[in-house]
Interface confidence: medium
């Protein structure tokens, strides 16, 4: 008999369902906008916007202060009075659209759908370890705005983006607005514009930079900014658009728009179409040859990775890389394939793509056909040829034109297609330790702490745990607060520890010891915790093996049994060499010889799967009682491993010991050339892992085994004569004495 | 029993480079972390950094980063040290050490080797 | 980088007294500290990890406590083989770092 110990799915180790509580805050309404902010004299403060109102929070989640930011023309509406009396527009509710922080005075910003989409900016001053907001200012001058020319109407009802950066003693605000037709014809926000702020907060400095969908493209090609981000010398936009100026707005895909951080200039505004794709290992028939694309960006996160993934990508240690979530559609509807897929684009890398594309259409030779591209914002032209021109002029540089790069940078899904199921709402990448940890939001509330690597087969979780009760998706925007992130989700905000929320998730010990050292998960005699929850009984040292199984369940009282146990933590080396005197089995009174592995019956455990065997002969003492009885594993001495060494005693019930007897043999006689079927009759004739008839001391080969019957074929005899016919189990012989008579053929 | 055996004393010539072994045996080398730690004369203890020979993966300290290569050769068992650009400030014994489980612990150590770097 | 503070530098001590050693950590590392002996000429010898766990084969007189920032190890009663060198060593981060040691002799 070969029995294997049956495999014990690695998702075993684990119970996602395992409720736990982090702090949160009721915003009183759908969260617009959160954003934090952590000064040097340790205070800080959580700004969380809702519609006609900002909360500022303490880094409790308890309320500091509110501020009424609408409706328009409301006479309790804080903000508004700012801009001295009005009516400065038509009435209606505020829905935030921009929260961001001016980290150089420092200050809150916010703007709005109402008021032309107008900004204020709130002086933040620290209280202790809190923050409270100055009484706004209003960043708008009616003498400088008018409906075509409107350096202070920043945000777009459908959407906008900003990002602050300093350049010298000024802020300048990198804003992106999604537009259409409406939006375009009241107050003219533009598509991509670098506002400076003027230095006695009135507003934005005139005169600014720009880049606006054409008129003709705004109802058929409408860009939607997704993130945006600043790193290095340069801002980055994501954007969501439709493929093509001219072909089926429907068909869309992802960029990247890439702006110069150090000069307020839209000259050197670049643009690349980065390609998200599912390569599954194993290519389904009629599968694209490059992998299923995922042209759409859900949501967006850069950060320094730590080694592993470095590693993986190909770039050292602590270096930029963004990523994204994409989904096959704007609907994100399950196609073939995962309904997310995370793809990972290394800074450097599409710095040198964006460089290497300008080189393309602006150095000999020229490649004829080459288009600049950004239709959508500019007159279509060849390269080397501004928007617009047949030719360079001798005092214009091709390089000081916006262009779109002419190839796309591809990567594909690092989960490998894992993430299955799972709508991915939000996204955000820290570096723990060595550890790259994507946290994601879900569409159906849950927090997946997860770790970002390449090589495996299976997701390596810190965690994966519902916010709340509510179910409600997580929303795009997350914030990061000492070591916490903050997530939204309907009208809460949540805190959740960058750490993972707690270790109850992990329901062995050695799947607890493995965790992640920042996870700070020891064992607490029967659970996985924290050491705040079970200071008596908490260690990160040891863990005790775990029988689950074992085989058979029953030995003859006379006689060995091989016996094989199943669990885990017996060795914790694959070879299965088990160090001299470490382990001790005993069953009943009666030890249990430990055997070296069979080498020939190692089989490779694919990771996904855990369990471990360990062999044992069992010679039952003189004094061993027939009946049920305990299996018992004691494992001292072993060595540490990598993560814990292995200490203690695992008891197993659900063993017998049992006497075989043999009740009768027929027939009793048979041809001296053998194949007489005999049938041996009696009780407990199958317990243990050996048997065997003997007839005249040769084997008769065995056909079948059950408790009260064994039948076996006779081998040819000698001559014709009466023979012994004796059964052993377990090596000993049953009692009773039996002959066979073989006769003439 | 556990036993790190490492390579003998070396004299070298500022500038030069010394490589140090460390021949582990009575365990499974790729069950734990091997670190490396250096002690000038009269001085106290200067952690280097250390390998995981199961994976290569290797951490060090950014005083010694970019002159240290810590290397494990798991068909021998032996894990090495090897120090670059060598000055007079590196004269010291160097000792390798068995990293304990994941604690960051050192439970067994090598007998030391010593290094003089001179002119 | 986290900075392990050990004091005294040396202390001397009679055969049968508590001796106390403290390290200071310069940044919260929880129970992540081990404490070392070494005779001279000779490796160091593991004797406390993880703050308070007694190593394999250490004889009961030694102990550790402590956690965050703050940890004392103690010989309950000095014995003349205890002369040596005591090092603590903090495992929360790389790169890992050791105290100064301190120096024990006997009165």
């Known amino acids: 008999e070969d029995w294997q110990c049956p495999r014990t799915p690695y998702a075993a180790s684990r119970d996602f369902d395992v409720k736990y509580v982090v702090p949160s805050f009721s915003a009183g309404g759908l969260v617009q906008a959160m954003v934090t902010y952590e000064g040097d004299r340790n205070e800080s403060a959580v700004f969380v916007a809702i519609r006609n109102r900002l909360h500022v929070l303490g880094p409790d989640l308890k309320s500091v202060q509110s501020l009424a930011t609408g409706p328009a023309g409301d006479p309790g509406c804080q903000t508004c009075a700012a801009c001295g009396p009005g009516p400065h527009g038509p009435p209606g509710d505020t829905d935030t659209k921009v929260l961001v922080l001016d980290p150089a005075l420092p200050a809150l910003v916010s703007c709005g759908s109402s008021l032309q989409g107008r900004c204020f900016l709130h002086d933040l001053e620290p209280q202790g370890t809190a923050v409270h907001l100055a009484a706004p200012a209003c960043l708008f001058s009616a003498h400088h705005n008018r409906p075509d020319d409107c350096p202070d109407c920043v945000a777009s009802p459908l959407g906008t983006r900003v990002t602050v950066v300093e350049q010298g003693q000024a802020s300048y605000f990198y804003v992106a607005s999604s537009l259409d037709a409406a939006v375009a014809a009241s107050f003219s926000p533009r598509s991509v514009s670098i506002r400076r702020l003027k230095a006695d907060a009135s507003g934005f400095a005139p005169g600014f930079v720009a880049l606006s969908v054409l008129p003709k493209h705004l109802v058929s090609y409408s860009i939607e900014y997704v993130h945006s981000f600043h790193t290095g010398a340069f801002v980055y936009f994501l954007t969501v658009q439709p493929a093509s100026v001219t072909d089926d707005p429907s068909a869309l895909h992802t960029r990247l728009a890439r702006l110069s951080a150090t000069e307020p200039e839209l000259g050197d505004y670049r643009e690349l179409v980065l390609d998200c794709r599912f390569a599954p290992k194993r290519r389904r028939r009629g599968a694209p040859e490059g992998g299923q694309p995922y042209p759409v960006l859900r949501v967006a996160h850069s950060a320094p990775v730590g080694a592993q993934l470095a590693t993986e990508l190909s770039i050292a240690e602590g270096q930029e890389v963004l990523f994204g979530v994409f989904v096959t559609g704007k609907d994100g509807g399950p196609g073939v394939g995962p309904n997310s897929v995370v793809c990972a684009f290394p800074i450097d890398l599409l710095d040198t793509l964006i460089d290497e594309g300008v080189e393309r259409c602006c150095e000999s030779p020229v490649h004829p056909g080459l288009r600049r591209g950004l239709d959508f914002f500019q007159s279509p032209s060849f390269c080397p040829n501004p928007p617009g021109l047949e030719a360079l002029s001798p005092n214009t540089s091709c390089r000081h034109f916006p262009l779109l790069v002419s190839s796309s940078f591809s990567r594909v899904d690092l989960f490998n297609g894992l993430l299955g199921p799972v709508q991915v709402t939000a996204l955000y990448v820290t570096r723990l330790d060595n550890v790259t940890v994507a946290h994601m939001g879900t569409m159906d509330g849950r927090i997946l702490q997860v770790e970002l690597v390449r090589s495996l087969n299976y997701l390596l979780y810190v965690s994966n745990f519902s916010l709340g009760d509510s179910g409600q998706p997580v929303q795009r925007d997350v914030s990061r607060l000492g070591d916490h992130l903050l997530f939204a989700s309907g009208d809460q905000v949540f805190q959740v520890p960058i750490q993972g929320p707690g270790c109850r998730h992990f329901l062995t010990c050695g799947r607890c010891l493995r965790a992640w050292h920042f996870m700070g998960c020891g064992w607490c005699g029967n659970m996985c915790g924290q050491q705040k929850e079970c200071p008596g009984s908490w260690q990160q040292d040891h863990c005790p093996p775990k029988l689950t199984e074992f085989h058979p369940h029953s030995g003859p009282l006379r006689g060995s049994t091989r016996l094989t146990l199943c669990g885990s933590n017996f060795y914790l080396h694959p070879s299965g060499l088990v160090p001299e005197g470490t382990h001790q089995v005993t069953v009943g009174q009666s030890p249990c010889r430990p055997l070296p592995k069979d080498s020939s019956k190692l089989r490779p455990v694919p990771r996904k799967d855990f369990v471990e065997e360990f062999e044992c002969e069992l010679e039952p003492l003189g004094t061993q009682a027939v009946g049920p009885t305990n299996v018992s594993l004691t494992v001292t001495n072993m060595p540490p491993g990598k993560h814990f060494r292995v200490d203690g005693t695992s008891v197993l019930r659900g063993f017998s010991f049992m006497e075989p007897v043999l009740i009768a043999v027929q027939p009793l006689f048979g041809p001296r050339a053998g194949g007489t079927c005999l049938t041996l009759e009696g009780q407990s004739l199958s317990v243990g892992t050996s048997r065997a008839v003997l007839v005249n001391g040769t084997e008769c080969l065995l056909a079948r085994v059950s408790e009260g019957q064994l039948l076996c074929a006779t081998p040819p005899g000698a001559t014709v004569a009466s023979v012994p016919l004796s059964l052993q189990v377990g090596g000993a012989q049953v009692p009773g004495s039996w002959t066979f008579q073989y006769r003439e053929d | 029993q556990v036993q790190l055996v490492q390579s003998g004393a070396e004299v070298k010539k500022p500038g030069a480079t010394v490589k140090i072994s460390c021949k582990v045996s009575g365990y499974t080398f790729t069950d734990t972390y091997i670190h490396w730690v250096q002690q000038a004369p009269g001085k106290g203890l200067e952690w280097m950094g250390r390998i995981d020979p199961a994976d290569g993966n290797r951490k060090s300290d950014p005083k010694f980063q970019v002159r240290v290569t810590i290397t494990a050769d798991t068909s021998t068992d032996t894990a090495y040290m090897e120090l670059s650009s060598l000055r007079s400030e590196d004269t010291a014994v160097y000792y390798c050490?068995?990293?304990?489980?994941?604690?960051?612990?050192?439970?067994?150590w090598g007998q030391g080797t010593l290094v003089t770097v001179s002119r | 980088d986290i900075q392990m503070t050990q004091s005294p530098s040396s202390l001397s001590a009679s055969v049968g007294d508590r001796v106390t050693i403290t390290c200071h950590a310069s940044?919260?590392?929880?129970?992540?500290l081990n404490w070392y002996q070494q005779k001279p000429g000779k490796a160091p010898k593991l004797l406390i990890y993880k703050a308070s766990n007694l190593h394999t084969g250490v004889p009961s007189r030694f102990s550790g406590s402590g956690s965050g920032t703050d940890f004392t190890f103690t010989i309950s009663s000095l014995q003349p083989e205890d002369i040596a060198t005591y090092y603590c060593?903090?495992?929360?981060?790389?790169?890992?770092?050791f105290g100064g040691g301190t120096k024990l002799e006997i009165k």
């Open positions: 050490a068995r990293g304990y489980g994941n604690l960051n612990a050192m439970d067994s």
């Open positions: 060593q903090q495992g929360q981060s790389y790169p890992l770092t």
């Open positions: 940044q919260n590392i929880n129970v992540w």
